[in-house]
């Protein structure tokens, strides 16, 4: 599984380094779950055709994925700090079931799919820790949560490969534009 | 194969306008993050604008804002620098280019470039 | 705004020799730095990013090294199609910035 941010080579022949702000673990946090994200994506795009797929709304329908939208805040148009940060820990804590589906969908990636959801579950946490507005933030309802994840496994093969690409591939984005954003604040 | 073709540019008058198109082929603009860049005549290369594919989001150079505008038909494949109140300043070739699809945001496809001169 | 200071501006040297460019954030970037070499008259074009992984195509005479503040692109064997000017480019935040530009030129 890769290294955690924090516990690369560089930083532990680094002691003397300055300890990362706040911002900058965030980045880090995120930057590592990208790079999870991405080997993620290969092993998906090698085993099907799906990358290349034009038949993506087919799945999308099923899907209510996090998405960002002008409204949020997180633009450079119209940009707002408590409003995007309370939409980015929101995306996220709507992001984890779609993590949990993920787990058991990877054949040689299956711990870097682990890392990916655990590293996200710290990143949230990292963003909580930032946000004034905690009470603004909704949190995903756990039966509607377990119901979406029954759905989605009980989908046939061709709909669940589809289903895990359009997961990577929404969450890459939805990560981007937070990297994006955050470093606006 | 996978290509940016240009056009768009000439001599204009201080606080003119002028539009650039950057028609792509080999690749949809609708799931790829573009920029454009430009340079000066002798001199490096400056960043003016992104357009993300993910909710049509837009950035821009300082030195820009409020004057230039990116936008993208998608039918047509094709993105477009709108820029306004142009000035001396803005003299230069403009190039069309693509971010590659990682997180590292490097530029793995460029346009020939168009110059666009302001001068009275 | 980071700003990205290459060194140095102009540099001479001959067919097989080994050189280094080097470009300086103002501030750490981790390992978001792209090379690009530039020839007159014509658009960049990517060499490498992430600050080590060479684009595909790319001879591998020409690798990347660094992270934080201070990244190195070297040419193990210059080759005659390789004298261009070569920019550095920090994608940490925007606006995205690149450096001044590095002329490597025949001695």
């Known amino acids: 599984a890769p290294v955690p941010p924090g516990e690369d080579s560089k930083d532990v022949a680094a002691p003397h380094r300055q300890p990362l702000t706040s911002s900058e673990r965030i980045d880090k946090q995120i930057r590592y779950i990208l790079d999870g994200i991405s080997a993620l994506r290969k092993e998906t795009c090698n085993k099907s055709n799906m990358c290349e797929s034009s038949k993506e709304a087919l799945a999308e329908n099923n899907l209510n994925l996090p998405k960002m939208a002008e409204k949020d805040g997180c633009f450079q148009s119209g940009f707002n700090e408590e409003t995007c940060l309370v939409k980015i820990i929101t995306g996220l804590l709507e992001f984890e079931v779609y993590l949990e589906y993920l787990q058991n969908r990877f054949e040689s990636s299956e711990e870097q799919a682990r890392a990916v959801q655990m590293s996200t579950k710290v990143l949230i946490q990292f963003l909580q820790k930032k946000a004034k507005n905690l009470d603004a933030i909704t949190t995903p309802d756990p039966t509607t949560n377990a119901s979406l994840l029954t759905k989605l496994q009980a989908q046939n093969q061709w709909l669940q490969d589809m289903t895990t690409h359009l997961i990577l591939r929404s969450f890459k984005e939805f990560l981007q534009s937070s990297l994006r954003a955050l470093r606006q604040m | 194969q996978v290509q940016l073709v240009q056009s768009g540019g000439g001599l204009i008058q201080p606080g003119g306008s002028l539009r650039l198109s950057c028609a792509a082929s080999?690749?949809?603009?609708?799931?790829?993050?573009m920029v454009w860049v430009r340079q000066a005549p002798g001199k490096g290369l400056e960043w003016v604008s992104d357009?993300?594919?993910?909710?049509?989001?837009?950035y821009y150079a300082d030195s820009v804002k409020g004057r230039f505008t990116v936008s993208r038909d998608i039918s047509k494949n094709t993105v477009y620098l709108q820029m306004n109140s142009l000035r001396a300043e803005d003299t230069g070739v403009y190039y069309c280019?693509?971010?590659?699809?990682?997180?590292?945001?490097?530029?793995?496809?460029w346009g020939r470039g168009t110059l666009v001169t302001v001068s009275s | 705004d980071i700003v990205m200071t290459q060194s140095p501006s102009t540099l001479s040297a001959s067919v097989g020799d080994r050189v280094t460019i080097t470009c300086r954030a103002s501030q750490g970037i981790s390992s978001w730095l792209a090379w690009y070499q530039q020839k007159p008259g014509r658009a960049p074009k990517a060499l490498i990013y992430k600050a080590s992984t060479l684009e595909s195509g790319v001879p591998s005479r020409f690798s990347g090294s660094g992270s934080g503040t201070d990244f190195t692109l070297t040419i193990s064997s210059l080759q005659p199609e390789d004298f261009a000017t070569y920019y550095c480019?920090?994608?940490?935040?925007?606006?995205?910035?690149f450096g001044q530009g590095t002329k490597l030129e025949i001695k």
């Open positions: 357009l993300y594919y993910y909710a049509g989001d837009t």
């Open positions: 080999g690749f949809t603009i609708s799931s790829n993050y």
């Open positions: 480019q920090q994608s940490y935040s925007t606006p995205w910035t």
């Open positions: 280019a693509r971010w590659a699809d990682d997180h590292y945001y490097h530029i793995d496809v």
